[in-house]
């Protein structure tokens, strides 16, 4: 903490300007009025203060606002935001998307810091849910944002916000996160026609159950192999050869190149070899012709 010393005569700051960069730390402490600083925060960013000088300015704001900064100050923090701790940020009440954008801009290009994570958490909790505009903003700055949320947080995402999700936003999602997002996507896109629906739902299909894949196979969707390879193994295994053929359409030929990889490998092992032969792709490893599947209840439940 900087000692309290009187401001030298003639040095009292009347406005926040470049002359302050020549002030020593103690002079900044003594000569800059905290209320003046708060009203002219937008100027701080344009002035090349040292990190030590920024520490003094932060200290002044902390003294003025011990319960947390008002949003009018927060919006103009600029690089001073990088000096804030998660504990500082927990005292804030950020409600404006513009404020959020301004602070995310400061951290742009860097990994999500604990400060940013706390800021986002405060903002989303303040709004009560992750609305479309917020999700748009957050995924623009952090494409992996959605995949960093807990199941509980994801479950509070309204289906309407799903429209803001781009395929790359789901790249690092855990299967459990897709489980939560998929039913929301289904709901969000339910009024679209077949081909448009498939284009939108495609990136969420890692959370689709078998029944939905079976339904898709009846709609001539022509799923590409990249999407098929991302499907849940447990959802693919019960599909029949005919259903997979319908699901993939002309892309069915790609199964040959993927026959050693999951889920194709596991699916092949569960099909009768004579059914696989009908594809004419030379897929090997199915249940040999003539073998009897003894567990009829299982077959019935799977087909």
């Amino acid at each position: 903490e900087v000692e309290k010393t009187a401001c030298p005569s003639g040095k009292k700051a009347r406005e926040i300007d470049e002359s302050l960069i020549f002030y020593k730390k103690w002079e900044l402490e003594a000569c800059v009025d905290a209320a003046l600083l708060a009203t002219q925060m937008d100027r701080v960013n344009a002035i090349p203060f040292t990190y030590e000088q920024l520490d003094v300015l932060k200290h002044k704001l902390d003294e003025l606002y011990p319960q947390g900064y008002p949003e009018s100050v927060i919006q103009h923090l600029g690089y001073l935001f990088l000096k804030m701790s998660p504990e500082d940020i927990r005292k804030w009440n950020v409600t404006s998307l513009e404020t959020l954008k301004a602070l995310l801009e400061v951290n742009k290009g860097h990994e999500m810091s604990p400060q940013v994570a706390t800021l986002i958490d405060r903002f989303v909790k303040g709004r009560g849910q992750l609305d479309k505009d917020t999700l748009d903003t957050l995924t623009a700055f952090y494409p992996g944002y959605l995949c960093s949320l807990s199941p509980e947080e994801l479950s509070s995402v309204p289906p309407s916000s799903i429209w803001a999700v781009r395929p790359q936003d789901l790249d690092t999602c855990d299967p459990r996160q897709l489980d939560v997002l998929y039913p929301k996507a289904r709901l969000a896109f339910q009024n679209m026609n077949g081909s448009e629906y498939f284009v939108k739902i495609q990136s969420f299909l890692g959370g689709a159950p078998t029944e939905d894949l079976k339904a898709l196979s009846q709609q001539n969707v022509s799923m590409d192999l990249a999407t098929f390879m991302k499907l849940r193994t447990d959802a693919v295994l019960p599909l029949t050869v005919a259903e997979v053929q319908k699901l993939l359409g002309p892309h069915v030929e790609g199964l040959k190149a993927e026959e050693r990889h999951r889920p194709v490998r596991d699916w092949i092992l569960r099909q009768r070899q004579d059914d696989l032969d009908t594809l004419g792709l030379g897929l090997q490893g199915g249940i040999p012709n003539g073998y009897l599947v003894l567990d009829l209840s299982m077959q019935e439940a799977l087909s």
Epitope: S150, P151, T172, L178, V180, P209
Partner: antibody
Framework: QVQLQESGPGLVKPSQTLSLTCTVS??????????WNWIRQHPGKGLEWIGY???????YYNPSLRGRLIISVDTSKNQFSLRLSSVTAADTAVYYC?????????????WGQGTTVTVSA | DIVMTQTPLSSPVTLGQPASISCRSS???????????LSWLQQRPGQPPRLLIY???NRFSGVPDRFSGSGAGTDFTLKISRVEAEDVGVYYC?????????FGGGTKVEIK
């Protein structure tokens, strides 16, 4: 508060199918962000995760049981079930259902009391 | 599959004394979301398991503060600061970072 209760036959013959149901009370199985798991414990041994189901019907199974296992959900009855086919003596165990999720994975905060299943002729 | 190895197998402890259980995973438990999904469960004789700790060090509600979790990456520890009679049972670590979810073999805590 949420409670889980397993039910099903305590004795199953080898090669038959074991069927168990877990009934959820005090909360909805359809509340998002929770995964409904089956876990078993062989006599005097440790715990083995079997698989989970989400209310949408999406499942994830332990690969060691894949092919013999079906987990299904009935949201109208607030229940989820396990079917394990072609059972052998190695499937003799106490079977537990448990809830995972909420604010973290691995947060298995609610467990059933467990039901003992013996596979024997 | 990730293999979870617990030591010791059994830990005889004097009432009021501390106890420590170690858990090591065969690979890092850091998830792609940068969290580490390592939990600790307690199983008293004749009862189902009960959640104590999740995400390495988060104590579940109602769990006494004498239980604490620590660690990172592949090495984790559960500490009981002062063992009480009701702490007798088997303790399991569990990873939920990667499928299939796997448990440690268990550590039996008993009173000397």
């Amino acid at each position: 508060q949420v409670q889980l209760q397993e039910s099903g036959p305590g004795l199953v013959k080898p090669s038959q199918t074991l069927s168990l149901t877990c009934t959820v009370s005090g909360g909805s199985i359809s509340s998002g962000g929770y995964y409904w798991n089956w876990i078993r414990q062989h006599p005097g041994k440790g715990l083995e995760w079997i698989g989970y189901i989400y209310y949408s019907g999406s499942t994830y199974y332990n690969p060691s049981l894949r092919g013999r296992l079906i987990i299904s959900v009935d949201t109208s009855k607030n229940q989820f079930s396990l079917r394990l086919s072609s059972v052998t003596a190695a499937d003799t165990a106490v079977y537990y259902c448990a809830r995972d999720g909420g604010d973290s994975y691995g947060r298995m905060d609610v467990w059933g009391q467990g039901t003992t299943v013996t596979v024997s002729a | 599959d990730i293999v979870m190895t617990q030591t010791p197998l059994s830990s005889p402890v004097t009432l009021g004394q501390p106890a420590s259980i170690s858990c090591r995973s065969s690979q890092s438990l850091v998830h792609s979301d940068r969290n580490t999904y390592l939990s600790w469960l307690q199983q008293r004789p004749g009862q189902p398991p009960r959640l104590l700790i999740y995400k390495i060090s988060n104590r579940f509600s109602g769990v006494p503060d004498r239980f604490s979790g620590s660690g990172a990456g592949t090495d984790f520890t559960l500490k009981i600061s002062r063992v009480e009679a009701e702490d007798v049972g088997v303790y399991y670590c569990m990873q939920a970072t990667q499928f299939p979810l796997t448990f440690g073999g268990g550590t039996k805590v008993e009173i000397k």
